[in-house]
């Protein structure tokens, strides 16, 4: 048994990193591997990591964690029974891909204005709240040729588009995504889109 | 109430042996780092050794390495000092003392919160 | 090893007026914000420590609110806004950041 790519490691800077690996051959992950880690501190023990399936040779492993601070290093052993396949670290403050924000709302009904709205995915409390910075993606169903990105680099998550720029009488979709500018992180993944309906017509003066 | 209760100490010669025991009760036993400290007479406070809630990890004193051994039984809820190789400069009053919480991913620390009363070790010829 | 260096070593008060130990480690015991791994242990005459003070500030259980720590990184004090009589001992702080868990000399704290 073989990895054949070695582990790389995500944090959500919350509760969870998320470790991929690719082994040399088809394997159950769950039953064959265990990732064992430790955070390098006083008296800390070592947990254990059981790895599901992602993709006929790929393992994925999601690591239970406390709030992360810069300081926290972790040893990581990915062992297959007795056999120790592999032995890294992993710093989850350099490692940082944010969790997607969810609650993606659509107000059709403010005058003339197309209100996006999306909740922060994490508490007050966490570093990252007051520097995540979003890009909410508009496309078309109707109109492939239609998608736009709007970067909403002010921490409020809300996001106004004056309806007079979207054609009338289609669908529109809309997603949202999140990164943290001062910690370096990747972008986050998607948020489940949302659909509405633009119904708005200009006034008969302006057509 | 939370309770540490020693035992073992003596009067032992130079090279000799001796197992320190301490008892916990009143708290979940296994779930916290233990840590021993000793004061010579007349002298202040030094750390001996430390050992995590499972026994997996284990720290000690530069002057006590390769002779003493910190072990625990946690279905006994106690914690061990096995002391080999006795020197004169081992006499001291040992206590046993409640450390961390080593369960959790990052330990929780309230400081070493509840001491036992110390059992007393005289290294003599 | 990190060093811990108390002062003074021995501190006369007068009952009703406060008292103050600083210590200095050698190197930081700043984990994390809010987590200076500094504690304070006062050990009566033929008594075990009993901990007074835990991660740099936090006052333990049963504590009588005239003990207060502060101070981050490198530098610590314990303050006492009233001695009492019952106050008398050796006090000790302790590094807990990583072992070996180093103790300062200790400070005698005597009624004048």
């Known amino acids: 048994m073989k990895v054949l790519q070695e582990p790389a490691c995500v944090s959500d800077y919350m509760s969870i990193s998320t470790c991929e690996w690719k082994m040399g051959g088809p394997t159950n992950c769950s039953a064959e591997l265990r990732l064992l880690y430790q955070l390098v501190f006083q008296s800390s023990e070592t947990h254990t990591c059981v790895p599901e399936n992602n993709g006929g040779v790929g393992c994925v492993c999601h690591l239970l964690m406390d709030d992360v601070v810069s300081m926290d290093n972790y040893t990581l052993d990915l062992w297959a029974g007795q056999q120790l396949l592999w032995k890294g670290s992993f710093k989850p403050s350099e490692h940082v891909k944010p969790r997607a924000p969810g609650n993606l709302t659509v107000h059709t009904n403010v005058s003339d204005t197309v209100l996006l709205t999306w909740s922060n995915p994490y508490p007050p409390d966490n570093y990252l709240y007051n520097d995540l910075t979003y890009a909410v993606n508009i496309w078309s169903e109707n109109d492939p040729a239609y998608s736009r990105i709007h970067n909403v680099t002010y921490l409020k998550p809300t996001l106004r588009i004056p309806a007079s720029t979207l054609k009338s009488g289609i669908s529109y979709r809309a997603r949202v995504r999140a990164w943290a500018q001062h910690y370096n992180t990747t972008w986050s993944e998607w948020s489940p889109s949302t659909k509405w309906y633009n119904s708005y017509r200009e006034p008969f003066e302006q057509r | 109430e939370v309770q540490l209760v020693e035992s073992g100490g003596g009067l032992e010669q130079p090279g000799g042996s001796l197992r320190l025991s301490c008892a916990g009760s009143g708290f979940t036993f296994r779930t916290y780092a233990m840590t021993w400290v000793r004061q010579a007479p007349g002298k202040g406070l030094e750390w001996v050794s430390s050992i995590s809630g499972d026994g997996s990890n284990t720290y000690y004193a530069d002057s006590v390495k390769g002779r003493f051994t910190i072990s625990r039984d946690n279905s006994k809820n106690t914690l061990y000092l096995q002391m080999n190789s006795l020197r004169a400069e081992d006499t001291a009053v040992y206590y046993c003392?409640?450390?961390?919480?080593?369960?959790?991913?990052?330990?929780?620390?309230?400081?070493?919160?509840?001491w036992g009363q110390g059992t007393t070790v005289t290294v003599s010829s | 090893d990190i060093v811990m260096t108390q002062s003074p070593l021995s501190l006369p008060v007068t009952p009703g007026e406060p008292a103050s130990i600083s210590c200095t480690a050698s190197q930081s015991l700043l984990y994390s914000i809010g987590y200076n791994y500094v504690d304070w242990y006062l050990q009566k005459s033929g008594q075990s420590p009993q901990l007074l003070i835990y991660?740099?500030?936090k006052r333990a259980s049963g504590v009588p609110d005239r003990f207060s720590g502060s101070g981050s990184g490198t530098d610590f004090t314990l303050k006492i806004s009233r001695v009492e009589a019952e106050d008398v001992g050796f006090y000790y702080c302790m590094q807990a950041l990583t072992t070996p868990y180093t103790f300062g000399q200790g400070t005698k704290l005597e009624i004048k």
């Open positions: 003392a409640k450390d961390r919480v080593s369960i959790t991913i990052r330990p929780r620390y309230y400081g070493l919160d509840v």
């Open positions: 991660l740099g500030n």
